[in-house]
């Protein structure tokens, strides 16, 4: 019987060109944790595994840095990053947990005011 | 260098039994989920059981679910396939395969060929 | 199950041409699929994990692409030592299927 539960960071925003970590925690259960998958909509970002350690898919390297723990740090953050976010959970004896995350990427403010303020 | 070197195969009659074995090297071998794959003569890949390096769990495809069984020795660097009442459908080569992260295979052995027939 | 059907069966090119495979799962697998290359007599062969990752010593002339349901495998400029057969398969959930195959053969 599965009695675990996910918790997330839920709705969050973050401004563009900044960085964000993106964290789930599971509770309520004393099964084992084996593997973490980090998806993006339907990109796999990043795998957890408890003996292989991280894999960052190669495609976010750049911009993908694991941890902290169990989560994953997302830099140079662009509006295109703004979506969902999973984190899925295989665990033993349960099986699998899944977490959902909506990230918000904003024009930073900074932008924003010079873009309002510029003298012509 | 990670090799993978599958034996056990040959001739058996139906309904006979037969254990392929896959000896690994060059790699923490229990670190690792290891799966079996099969391909009858002229025929695709067919998927046929899996099993966990971390907890040992194991998966089955339905045609061999209840014949076969997959085990793993850590101690020994081996992986396992035992199979039971088999059936001429059964005549393949059979390839062991390592699955980092559950995911992909990016190691396979060179196979070894099963034939059920009387 | 997860059914994965690939197109075309078989294909034939010449030295140069630039090849594509497509792989359609029966539900939508986010990026877990996987291309094999598989020669006569031979063990498969990883070329492409998790949709469009280059597996390691693998000519950057493959390349994969797609997510959700619809994938594509490119040879962008068919080599003498690419005539194959292909394979995709899902990782998605048990059971793996592997698409039909794919014969890559000479014009």
């Known amino acids: 019987m599965m009695t675990g539960t996910i918790e997330t960071t839920g709705n969050i925003s973050a401004e563009k060109g900044g960085s964000i970590i993106l964290q789930c925690h599971l509770s309520s259960t004393t099964a084992q944790v084996t593997q973490v998958n980090w998806e993006q909509q339907d990109q796999l970002l990043a795998i957890c595994n408890a003996d292989l350690g991280w894999h960052i898919s190669p495609s976010f390297k750049d911009r993908v840095a694991p941890g902290p723990g169990l989560g994953l740090t997302l830099q140079s953050l662009t509006v295109n990053d703004t979506g969902e976010y999973f984190c899925i959970y295989h665990t033993y004896p349960d099986g699998t947990y899944t977490g959902r995350i909506f990230l918000e990427v904003l024009e930073s403010s900074v932008a924003e005011h010079g873009a309002r303020f510029q003298i012509p | 260098e990670v090799q993978l070197l599958e034996s056990g195969g040959g001739l058996v009659q139906p309904g006979g039994s037969l254990r392929l074995s896959c000896a690994a090297s060059?790699?923490?071998?229990?670190?690792?989920?290891m799966h079996w794959v099969r391909q009858a003569p002229g025929k695709g890949l067919e998927w046929v059981a899996a099993?966990?390096?971390?907890?040992?769990?194991?998966y089955y495809a339905d045609s061999v679910k209840g014949r076969f069984t997959i085990s793993r020795d850590n101690s020994k660097n081996t992986l396992y396939l035992q199979m039971n009442s088999l059936r001429a459908e059964d005549t393949a080569v059979y390839y062991c395969?390592?699955?980092?992260?559950?995911?992909?295979?990016?190691?396979w052995g060179q196979g070894t060929l099963v034939t059920v027939s009387s | 199950d997860i059914q994965m059907t690939q197109s075309p069966s078989s294909l034939s090119a010449s030295v140069g041409d630039r090849v594509t495979i497509t792989c359609r799962a029966s539900?939508?697998?986010?990026?877990?699929l996987n291309w094999y290359q598989q020669k006569p007599g031979k063990a498969p062969k990883l070329l492409i994990y998790?949709?469009?990752s280059l597996q390691s010593g693998v000519p950057s002339r493959f390349s994969g692409s797609g997510s959700g349901t619809d994938f594509t495998l490119t040879i962008s400029s068919l080599q003498p030592e690419d005539f194959a057969t292909y394979y995709c398969?899902?990782?998605?959930?048990?059971?793996?299927?592997f698409g039909g195959g794919t014969k890559v053969e000479i014009k």
């Open positions: 395969a390592r699955v980092p992260y559950g995911v992909w295979m990016d190691y």
């Open positions: 060059g790699f923490t071998f229990s670190s690792y989920s």
């Open positions: 099993i966990k390096g971390n907890t040992g769990s194991t």
């Open positions: 539900q939508s697998i986010s990026s877990y």
């Open positions: 998790a949709a469009s």
């Open positions: 398969q899902q990782s998605y959930s048990t059971p793996l299927t």
